[in-house]
Interface confidence: medium
């Protein structure tokens, strides 16, 4: 009876900086007692480690066991269905999980207004799980870039984009007043990682913020 159960159709990682989650799709017609076994292989150490014997969710947080991701050759994971004494064949992730698969994010964006300029400061992510020396700026030490999108309310110029090469930016508002909403998407010019747009931060600009100079 070893392989009567169908295998999970697909297994994949979804990762942000020190937030490494393995996902899988359920087997068809699973029962209430079906659970999933998760195993992990680190490239260079060619043996599978069992991580969870019986997960009843469809995802598993592997951050704690992949903390060296940013200094390693990467990982593969595999998942199989288990129901009592029966189990399926393993389904293995299609691709190597490496630093290239990590989606880049920012921690937050702080906005302030000074003399008709919107000044923005990008806060880098500071995940609790990250070892003290593994900061975003130490791992991605060169070629950090940020795409900035600004939406003005009201106004039909919804998006303006700028790529900046540092964590500070400024926008001259040219006498425009209203609410300005900003999103930031990080990238690293030398890498292929995807970036995720931050949540929108908004700031209101009224006439009081402009000073007249003769």
């Amino acid at each position: 009876h070893g392989t009567e159960l169908p295998s999970p159709p697909s297994v994949w990682f979804e990762a942000e900086f020190f937030h490494h989650i393995l996902h899988w799709t359920p087997i068809p017609n699973q029962s209430e007692s079906t659970c999933y076994e998760v195993a992990l292989l680190r490239y260079g150490i060619e043996s599978w480690n069992s991580i969870s014997n019986c997960s009843q969710t469809l995802s598993y947080d592997l951050t704690a066991v992949t903390l060296d991701l940013y200094h390693s050759n990467g990982y593969r994971a595999r998942v199989r269905a288990v129901d009592g004494s029966r189990h399926s064949n393993w389904t293995v992730t299609n691709t190597r999980f490496s630093v290239d698969e990590v989606t880049l994010t920012v921690g937050s964006v702080n906005l302030e207004i000074h003399n008709g300029f919107i000044l923005g400061k990008i806060q880098l992510p500071r995940p609790k799980m990250a070892p003290a020396n593994d900061t975003y700026e130490s791992i991605f030490s060169h070629f950090r870039e940020y795409e900035i999108a600004i939406r003005k309310v009201p106004g039909n110029f919804t998006f303006t984009h700028k790529k900046v090469k540092h964590e500070n930016f400024s926008l001259l508002t040219s006498g425009e007043v209203g609410e300005f909403c900003v999103q930031v998407k990080p990238s690293v010019a030398s890498r292929s990682n995807k970036g995720m747009w931050s949540k929108e931060e908004c700031i209101s600009l009224t006439r009081q913020y402009f000073t007249v100079t003769n």
Epitope: F157, T160, K162, K163, L171, T173, S174
Partner: nanobody, 127 residues
Framework: EVQLLESGGGLVQPGGSLRLSCAAS????????VGWFRQAPGKGREFVSA????????YFGDFVEGRFTISRDSSKNTLYLQMNSLRAEDTAVYYC????????????????????WGQGTLVTVSS
């Protein structure tokens, strides 16, 4: 004095693509923001996209929705607008324009900020 000459317009089916070019002569663009506006029949001029000549800043009107890409080739002193997934409502005369300065500023969304204009090239999106 800057002279701007647009090309690349024409008739295209909905969902199709066109690449507009704008060749500049008379002076280099090195400290300019350059862009595209459009004017549909019976309507006013509308901002489409702009780019600083050093390439670090691009601006887009909200209707663009990721369909258009602006770029420039400084060695050829030419500005480009790659337009994909074209719709009937993109039908318009497209004008190239140049403004002095390249501060990141909302002024470049305004027609009045641009000192130099081309004659325009007609884009018709129709089946």
């Amino acid at each position: 004095e800057v002279q701007l000459l647009e090309s690349g317009g024409g008739l295209v089916q909905p969902g199709g693509s066109l690449r507009l070019s704008c060749a500049a002569s008379g002076r280099t663009f090195s400290s300019h923001t350059v862009g595209w506006f459009r004017q549909a029949p019976g309507k006013g001029r509308e901002f489409v996209s702009a780019i600083t000549w050093n390439g670090d800043t691009t601006y887009f009107g909200d209707f663009v929705e990721g369909r258009f890409t602006i770029s420039r080739d400084s060695s050829k002193n030419t500005l480009y607008l790659q337009m994909n997934s074209l719709r009937a409502e993109d039908t318009a005369v497209y004008y190239c324009a140049a403004a002095t300065g390249q501060v990141w500023s909302l002024q470049y969304l305004r027609e009045s900020s641009y000192a130099y204009w081309g004659q325009g090239t007609l884009v018709t999106v129709s089946s």
